[in-house]
Structure formats: C-alpha cells, structure tokens
C-alpha cells in the first residue's frame, strides 16, 4: 500500500525537485565532458605561452565541473528514484548524501572565504587560458563559449595584461555588445571584475550558498518526512 494525502504530495514534490536536480547535473556533466574531450580544448595541454608551458588551471576547473555534475546526477537519482519507488533504503542513502554534501558545503564555504584571494587568482588564470585558447585556435568553440560566459556574466571584456593579438581579436569579435575595450584602457577589465566579485560582491556568493544550504535542509526534511510516512504506511 502506497503513501496517502500530504505524504503523497511530498513524494511527488521530492520527485520533481530531484528530477530537475538530476537534469541540471546531467547538463553540467555533459558540458564538462565536452570541454574536456573536445580535441580543440585538449590542445590546451600542449599550448605554450612564449617560452613557458601553459598552466593547467583550465583542466582543474573542468574536473571540478565533472565532479559536481556527477555528484548532482547521483544524488538527484537517489532522491528521484527513492521517492517514486518509496524506498526507505534509497531515501536513507539520499539523506546521508545530503548531510555529507551539506558538511562539504560548509567546509568549502569556510575554506573559500579563507582562500578567496587564491581562488580569485585561479579564476583569472582560468579565464586567461580560455582566452588564450580561443585566440590561438580560432576553431576552439568550447574555449570561445567559456570566454563568452565570463564576458556576459561579469559584463567585462579582456584584461590589462592582454597581448596585442588578443586585444585585436577581442575588439573585433569577442566583446559583449555595449562594452568598449578601447575606451579608458580596459575600464571593463575582467580581472578587476573577478577581484570585485571575490571582495566587494562576496555577499552574492554567500547568498547563493545560503540558498543552496536552505534547499538541502528542505530536501533533508522532506526525505525524512517521506521516509517516516512510508514506514507508517507499511505498518497498517
């Protein structure tokens, strides 16, 4: 006999919520795997900037995305399938995963706040490498997509450390409409915008983290309520 009434409502709410979560994880994982295995991005490993080999921040970022996408898909599946099957075992595992993820988020938040300058530096390096790849290999659509995302999200274009060629390519092709790379010598510097994000706008990242944490707590409560509901319905 299945759950009834309010518990049934929770069951479908949990299903829909985790199905969306699972889909989002799939999209993230798909994009990350595309970025990782596309031959044009793979060329980044062998890129040299002047006489120095390029650092692999780009790849570290992609591996983080792959991990995030995989975890999201796994946890989403547990919640989704556990709810629809009314499985106490799956829901219990789902709950445990959420507790672990919650702890990881809190730990990551503390670590991130302490190391925000290093993270900002790594993000800038990631941007620089994507930009370098987009310019060197003008067929590298994935690198172009990364650069475009930076430019549109942060409403910036280029940086004060650009080479002549990169400046010219950005000016003609990669700056979001309305931004003028030439005026006031890079007043819309992406490096500056990244620094601003990790200092002046740190509260935005904090709000996003709190929203994620609240959703996690909400899901934990729902999964426990549903678990109890399933246990109670199986007694009668």
């Amino acid at each position: 006999m299945g759950v009834e009434g309010c518990t049934k409502c929770i069951k479908y709410l949990l299903f829909v919520f985790n199905f969306v979560f699972w889909l989002a994880g799939g999209v993230i994982l798909g994009v990350a795997l595309w970025l990782r295995h596309d031959p044009q991005t793979t060329n980044l490993l062998y890129l040299e900037l002047g006489d120095k080999p390029a650092p692999n921040t780009f790849y570290v970022g992609i591996y983080i995305l792959i991990a995030v996408g995989a975890v999201m898909m796994f946890v989403g599946f547990l919640g989704c399938y556990g709810a629809i099957q009314e499985s106490q075992c799956l829901l219990g595992t789902f709950f445990t995963c959420l507790v672990i993820l919650f702890a990881c988020e809190v730990a990551a938040g503390i670590w991130g706040f302490v190391n925000k300058d290093q993270i900002a530096k790594d993000v800038k390096q990631f941007y620089d490498q994507a930009l370098q790849q987009a310019v060197v290999d003008d067929d590298a659509n994935n690198a172009k997509a990364v650069v475009k995302t930076f430019h549109e999200t942060l409403d910036c274009c280029g940086s004060s450390t650009l080479t002549a060629l990169t400046t010219s390519v950005l000016k003609n092709n990669a700056c979001p409409s309305g931004s003028n790379i030439i005026s006031n010598l890079f007043k819309e510097d992406c490096h500056q915008k990244i620094d601003d994000l990790f200092s002046g706008k740190l509260y935005l990242i904090g709000i996003a983290a709190i929203v994620v944490a609240v959703i996690m707590i909400f899901e934990m409560i729902l999964s426990m309520v549903l678990c109890c509901g399933i246990r109670n319905s199986s007694v009668y």
Epitope: A164, T167, V169, L185
Partner: antibody
Framework: EVQLLESGGGLVQPGGSLRLSCAAS????????MSWVRQAPGKGLEWVSY????????DYADTVKGRFTISRDNSKNTLYLQMNSLRAEDTAVYYC????????????WGQGTLVTVSS | QSVLTQPPSASGTPGQRVTISCTGS?????????THWYQQLPGTAPKLLIY???NRPSGVPDRFSGSKSGTSASLAISGLRTEDEADYYC???????????FGGGTKLTVLG
C-alpha cells in the same frame, strides 16, 4: 627552414586590382596567424592586415579597410591579399609575415613583392 | 609622422656601443604592450631582432639587447660590427588606433 615567398606584384593603374600570394613552407602554416606589412619606397614599415589560423578572425588598417581582403588556403599553405580600388599611396613592397602568438610579434618575413600604382 | 618616434640616424665605430631609442605613448608602449625590434639589412626583408622588450630569438648575437621603461624602449648594440649597418625598426601595438605600429626607422651607419 621557414620560407615565405610572395608573388603577384606589378604595375597597376589607379582604381585597378591586384592579388598577392604568399607561399609558406618550413612550419605549420595552418596553425599560425599570418599578416601583410608594407613598405613604401624609402619609407618605414606599415601593418596592413592579419588573418587567424582558420580564417575566423581578420583585421585591417584603416587606410585599406573596405578595399583589401586577406584570405588563406591552408590546404595549399598559401596566404592571399586581394587589393581593389588601388591608389598611388598603395605603392609599396608588400611583405607577408607569420605572427607568433607566444612572442606577440612578426617572427618570419618573406622577401616582399613590389606593387606600383601609377597611370 | 610615425606613432613611435625613433631618431632617423645613428652611427658608431666598430667595437663601440650604440643605443637607439623608441618613444611611444600611454596607448602603446606605456599601455603595457611589448616592444619588438626588427633589423632590415640593405635590399632585404626585415628580420626579428628582439621580441617582448628584451628577448632574443635564437641565432641573434647577444651583442643586441633591448629594454623598456615607461613609454619608451631602446635597443643597444655593443661591440659594433660593419655587418650591423642596417635600418632598425621598433614595433608595438596601439590600443587607440587598434593597429600594430612601427617606428619611422633608424639608419645605423658603422664608420671607418
């Protein structure tokens, strides 16, 4: 050994057209940005245009914009410059040069081809 | 009138040290763009001599050195030789004009 060999120069009347070619060898042409730089008789160097490795990006000096078109054929290892509506001030030796991203400079140059615009 | 200013001529005797200056502005050399130097021997194509302000491509003797400070750059040739007689051009990128810019060139004469 890197070699860039320009051809196609000559005497042309004002308003006329000319197509310059640059045959490349000794390096991976298809992964290099290429450029045209000119030098008027007895004068200094002037950058004209560049093209990216797969032809996605191009740019021109204001003095030639709308009149000159840069292109390339990676299968033939050849760079081109189509020059239309030629003027007397376009008279120069035209050099083809490979552009190094790492060095951010014109690292190899051809021997040049002379274009004379005169009536 | 070139965007980058170079002295039209320079001279020196064999073994001497000669310096060629290249003055730009805050939209090119002063904006952080690298300065490069090219040597053009009589009747030949230019050849990259110094890239990235002070780096020498392989095959260029260490008698040639480059430096940059503020909105100016300079090329120094020590132990001058007769085969150094050529035109020398500095080059950078101008962010206002959005073009690669060259100096007017300096004709180096080796006396005696």
């Amino acid at each position: 050994e890197v070699q860039l060999l320009e051809s196609g120069g000559g005497l042309v009347q004002p308003g006329g057209s000319l197509r310059l070619s640059c045959a490349a060898s000794g390096f991976t042409f298809s992964s290099n940005y290429m450029s045209w730089v000119r030098q008027a008789p007895g004068k200094g160097l002037e950058w004209v245009s560049y093209i990216s490795s797969s032809s996605s990006y191009t740019d021109y000096a204001d003095t030639v914009k709308g009149r000159f078109t840069i292109s390339r054929d990676n299968s033939k290892n050849t760079l081109y410059l189509q020059m239309n509506s030629l003027r007397a001030e376009d008279t120069a030796v035209y050099y083809c040069a490979s552009y190094s991203y790492g060095r951010d400079s014109f690292d190899y140059w051809g021997q040049g081809t002379l274009v004379t615009v005169s009536s | 009138q070139s965007v980058l200013t170079q002295p039209p001529s320079a001279s020196g005797t064999p073994g001497q040290r000669v310096t060629i200056s290249c003055t730009g502005s805050t939209s090119n050399i002063g904006a952080g763009y690298d300065t490069h130097w090219y040597q053009q021997l009589p009747g030949t194509a230019p050849k990259l001599l110094i890239y990235g302000n002070s780096n020498r491509p392989s095959g260029v003797p260490d008698r040639f050195s480059g430096s940059k400070s503020g909105t100016s750059a300079s090329l120094a040739i020590s132990g001058l030789r007769t085969e150094d007689e050529a035109d020398y051009y500095c080059q950078s990128y101008d962010t206002n004009l959005s073009v690669w810019v060259f100096g007017g060139g300096t004709k180096l004469t080796v006396l005696g």
